[in-house]
Interface confidence: low
């Protein structure tokens, strides 16, 4: 049975399509191609005479068609008007005609899309935003990407208008994007430039740094305040309830005990109209007890690697202090083999390894003073490995 096949079935505008013919009969006079689903002389594209190998254009010929000796028809530089059915008529030597109909679909090369938005400066937890992918075109699939990934499943994301519109319900600060839309048809795809949202939010509860509470008289007090906010928050400071200044940082040189009190940071976002405050207590004290130098002791100072364990103890007579340990200027513990116990007074290493050899010391401190022990040296030896088979290595 005579059949035709389109290569490809879906064609991009401006490209070419080949109408292939299968099972062409023997003993032929010739054949003709027609636009449409039936033989119609007014819609003949081309005829071909086998004997003369002559192709004759018909009324529907556009000059873009080429017929081949095997009856296949090539149409170049196709337009959307070329979409549809094509009929091949084969004239056999017995003058009995045979027909076959094929079809193809021409799609446009899609333009680069763009994203329009109904609100590019939404307020967190308050506004919704609708993105629309332009232009609207027929036979087109619309896809959306957030942060270069396809849309996550979320009750806050809604697609509508044939997926052309993406709505974010109740935006959050994490919804800044970028957002891209992609349009696709069977022959082409194109993605928009990225669009970002300027989500207005905050301020969150501010944090005051550093975290220190105790200061000595004569020191400089330098406090900094930060609250996550868009646009950035405006800051002001109050001491014991009295307004001081509208800056993010507060600096008081050469403090005295009179500077003790409640320090309040006030953060304000003029767009959201929200305010947040944080209060910090600062204590300036004359009392400056010198923390005594702690003593460090080891259960043994020379150990066998991968076999022995060792306990280091930090001793002090002071009260209300904290203890921390150091090894080669690094804070401990630094591995799972090291454990602190008894309020950090004891450091246990089990088992000891070669890399544990070196200098250890402890430090005792309170809010306004600290002191450290003399160092202690830990030596790690390894026994010679026994010979497995009596052979010397080499």
């Amino acid at each position: 049975q005579l059949t035709t096949e389109s290569m490809p079935f879906n064609v991009a505008e401006g490209k070419e399509v080949l109408l292939l013919v299968h099972n062409l009969p023997q003993q032929l006079f010739g054949y003709s191609w027609y636009k449409g689903e039936r033989v119609d002389g007014n819609r003949q594209i081309v005829g071909y005479a086998i004997g003369t190998q002559q192709a004759t254009p018909g009324p529907a010929n556009s000059g873009r068609e080429t017929i081949y000796p095997n009856a296949s028809l090539l149409i170049q530089n196709v337009t959307q008007n070329d979409t549809g059915f094509y009929t091949l008529q084969v004239i056999k030597s017995d003058l009995v005609n045979e027909e076959a109909t094929g079809q193809f679909h021409v799609y446009p090369e899609l333009p680069k899309p763009s994203i329009s938005s109904n609100n590019s400066n939404p307020v967190e937890d308050k506004d919704a935003v609708a993105f629309t992918c332009e232009p609207e075109t027929q036979d087109t699939t619309y896809l959306w990407w957030i942060n270069n990934q396809s849309l996550p499943v979320s009750p806050r994301l809604q697609l509508s208008n044939g997926n052309r519109t993406l709505t974010l319900l109740s935006v959050t600060r994490n919804d800044t994007g970028p957002y891209e839309c992609e349009i696709q048809n069977p022959v082409s795809a194109n993605r928009s430039d990225p669009v970002t949202l300027n989500v207005t939010y905050g301020p969150d509860t501010p944090t005051i740094s550093p975290s220190d509470t105790y200061y000595r008289p004569g020191a400089n007090l330098s406090l900094s305040c930060y609250a996550a906010s868009n646009p950035p928050a405006q800051y002001s400071w109050l001491i014991n309830g009295t307004f001081q200044q509208s800056t993010q940082e507060l600096f008081i040189p050469n403090i005295t005990v009179n500077n003790s009190g409640s320090y309040t940071c006030h953060a304000n976002n003029s767009v959201t109209g929200c305010n947040r405050t944080t209060v910090k207590t600062i204590i300036v004290t004359e009392l400056s007890p010198v923390v005594a130098k702690p003593q460090i002791k080891a259960s043994k100072t020379t150990v066998t690697g991968d076999k022995d364990s060792v306990n280091l103890t930090c001793s002090t007579n002071d009260t209300g202090i904290s203890i921390r340990w150091f090894f080669k200027n690094q804070s401990l513990p630094s591995s799972e083999r090291m454990k602190l116990s008894q309020g950090n007074t004891t450091l246990s290493i089990n088992p000891v390894k070669r890399e544990d050899a070196g200098t250890y010391w402890c430090e005792v401190f309170n809010p306004i003073s600290k002191n450290q022990s003399d160092p202690i040296m830990l030596n790690v030896n390894y026994n010679a490995l026994p010979q497995e088979n009596g052979l010397s290595p080499g």
């Epitope: 401006g14 490209k15 081949y68 296949s72």
Partner: antibody
Framework: EVQLLESGGGLVQPGGSLRLSCAAS????????LYWVRQAPGKGLEWVAT????????SYADSVKGRFTISRDNSKNTLYLQMNSLRAEDTAMYYC?????????????WGQGTLVTVSS | DIVMTQSPDSLAVSLGERATINCKSS????????????LAWYQQKPGQPPKLLIY???TRESGVPDRFSGSGSGTDFTLTISSLQAEDVAVYYC?????????FGGGTKVEIK
């Protein structure tokens, strides 16, 4: 007699570019679909790209999409493969091939190949 | 994309014995327009380009000895060498030729036992 002769292979650094050519003779060049196929040393055959009779339709293997471009000059009876952003894994013998008949079909005729080596 | 899977990877057969190579496609290669299976088989000897043996799954290319035959339909195909000759030692590849996907199988090396 159908003949396909590839050229343009050689040594190139990763990230570099190379343009392969395939000169055809012995048949009506503009009537046939053409292909590039490659074979890494000691590995199997991998179809790389296809081009239609007029050059209006092209298709590529995922491994080269966006980096390689197939084209043809029917007036010169020559097929081309422009290879950009080359990687070590592009090292292979590159063959051009011709379809059996007018449409896209099995690869009836092959060239002898040209070797591309991507190495620093 | 269509994935073509060949088995076995290698095959050792005595001279004069039958060799059978299988090829499985991840989707049907049967073209409803002409009821033909769009599968080809190629033979490649060391240092040479591949040579077409069979197309449309079972149609032998002109000049190919009749000891080579192809069979199968849809997704499962077989190349059979009915009586292996010394000159048949080569790697054999199956290939989908459904436009625009021309994926090859991984190849089967045929040797003499």
């Amino acid at each position: 007699e159908v003949q396909l002769l590839e050229s343009g292979g050689g040594l190139v650094q990763p990230g570099g570019s190379l343009r392969l050519s395939c000169a055809a003779s012995g048949f009506s060049f503009s009537d046939y679909y053409l292909y590039w196929v490659r074979q890494a040393p000691g590995k199997g055959l991998e179809w790389v790209a296809t081009i239609s009779v007029g050059g209006g339709q092209t298709s590529y293997a995922d491994s080269v999409k966006g980096r390689f471009t197939i084209s043809r000059d029917n007036s010169k009876n020559t097929l081309y493969l422009q290879m950009n952003s080359l990687r070590a894994e592009d090292t292979a013998m590159y063959y051009c091939a011709r379809a059996m008949y007018y449409g896209p079909a099995w690869f009836a005729y092959w060239g002898q190949g040209t070797l591309v080596t991507v190495s620093s | 994309d269509i994935v073509m899977t060949q088995s076995p990877d290698s095959l050792a057969v005595s001279l004069g014995e039958r060799a059978t190579i299988n090829c499985k496609s991840s989707q049907s290669l049967l073209n409803s327009a002409n009821q033909k299976n769009y599968l080809a088989w190629y033979q490649q000897k060391p240092g040479q380009p591949p040579k077409l043996l069979i197309y449309f799954a079972s149609t032998r290319e002109s000049g190919v000895p009749d000891r080579f035959s192809g069979s199968g339909s849809g997704t499962d195909f077989t190349l059979t060498i009915s009586s292996l000759q010394a000159e048949d030692v080569a790697v054999y590849y199956c290939q989908s030729h459904i436009y625009p996907n021309f994926t090859f199988g991984g190849g089967t090396k045929v040797e003499i036992k």
